[in-house]
């Protein structure tokens, strides 16, 4: 039968390039049964996982999976770097992969990529 | 270079629907870190963030105003409208579109629209 | 939201002097704040922007300082055509806010 652990759907060395300025959705995918879990979000800062305690944050439920959402409103140059969810389950602590987020600000880079640009070339925003 | 204008009725009545045009050019809504925004000043006061919408789309408003205000933008046309429902006089002000690129800082304006709320 | 405030509300000076206008955040906006100068009948001009760069064309005699909470706006050299109102305004957070502003008139 289907495993009623709590699952948090990160993919290991996941990344998001994006802008400074602009409004940012960062989507924890949580696979659950029964009872929500408790989430919350922290921001790595070298060894240790810095909670992320004043930060809006907002639950998207889906047929067959739920985000818990940490909003960016909007993006700041500091807000460069790694993040990772977690999740409490029956006095279990469930931590996910990291994903990185490479944040640019368009005013200082070398060229202003297109919508288009973004999709298809990535690497422009943070090489 | 870039331009902004704003376009729409100078008076409106109480209880009815402002609708404001933004025409630009020297951008396109569509390059990366862009946003198009609306700012009022009423006469002699301050000045009031009221809404944005940014290259992706997204769109961010005031919220002692969300629920009176929707701004949509047509990138073929380079232009962006702000409608704002239920006018009252003290809605009385001039009416400015702005530019952003990057952080939220406003470099280019248009000269400003005075709506001014009357019966 | 974040409420900025800015004092003085006016200030009388001469050509020449040494002008310094504050601005203060209800909370800690790190060095997200712009200055725009404003003349009557006019569009708002960003003078400063991210607390302390100088937007392109902006003549070296203002310049901003301060990060967190405090703020400042200085004209080092008044002169004629500096005779404006003065805004800040934060980008740290929606919705975006002005500080009431700051009134450059002739003593």
């Known amino acids: 039968k289907e495993s009623c652990d709590v699952q948090l759907y990160i993919k290991r060395q996941s990344e998001h390039s994006i802008l400074a300025g602009d409004p940012f959705e960062l989507e924890c995918p949580v696979k659950y049964c029964a009872n929500r879990p408790h989430v919350t979000w922290c921001k790595l800062n070298g060894t240790t996982c810095v909670k992320l305690e004043d930060r809006q944050t907002s639950w998207k439920e889906e047929k067959n999976i739920s985000f818990f959402i940490l909003h960016f409103e909007p993006v700041l140059p500091n807000d460069n770097g790694s993040y990772r969810c977690s999740a409490n389950f029956q006095s279990n602590l469930i931590e996910s992969h990291s994903t990185t987020l490479y944040v640019t600000d368009v005013k200082s880079a070398s060229e202003r990529p297109s919508k288009d640009e973004m999709a298809s070339r990535p690497w422009l925003l943070y090489r | 270079q870039i331009t902004l204008k704003e376009s729409g009725p100078t008076l409106v009545k109480p209880t009815q629907t402002l609708t404001l045009t933004c025409t630009f050019s020297g951008f396109s809504l569509s390059t990366g870190g862009v946003g198009v925004g609306w700012i009022r000043q009423p006469p002699g006061k301050a000045l009031e963030w009221l809404a944005q919408?940014?290259?992706?789309?997204?769109?961010r408003y005031s919220p002692s105003l969300k629920s009176r205000l929707t701004i949509t933008k047509d990138t073929s046309k380079n232009q962006v409208v702000l409608t704002m429902t239920n006018m009252d006089p003290v809605d009385t002000a001039t009416y400015y579109c702005?530019?952003?690129?990057?952080?939220?800082?406003?470099?280019?304006w248009g000269q400003g629209t005075l709506v001014t709320v009357s019966s | 939201d974040i409420q900025m405030t800015q004092s003085p509300s006016s200030v009388s000076a001469s050509v020449g002097d040494r002008v310094t206008i504050t601005c203060r955040a209800s909370q800690g906006i790190s060095s997200w704040l712009a200055w725009y100068q404003q003349k009557p009948g006019k569009a708002p001009k960003l003078l400063i922007y991210?607390?302390?760069g100088l937007q392109s064309g902006v003549p070296s005699r203002f310049s901003g300082s301060g990060s967190g909470t405090d703020f400042t706006l200085t004209i080092s050299s008044l002169q004629p055509e500096d005779f404006a109102t003065y805004y800040c305004q934060q980008a740290n957070s929606f919705p975006f806010t002005f500080g009431p502003g700051t009134k450059v008139d002739i003593k």
């Open positions: 702005t530019h952003k690129l990057g952080m939220n800082y406003f470099d280019y």
């Open positions: 919408i940014f290259w992706t789309g997204d769109k």
């Open positions: 991210a607390a302390s």
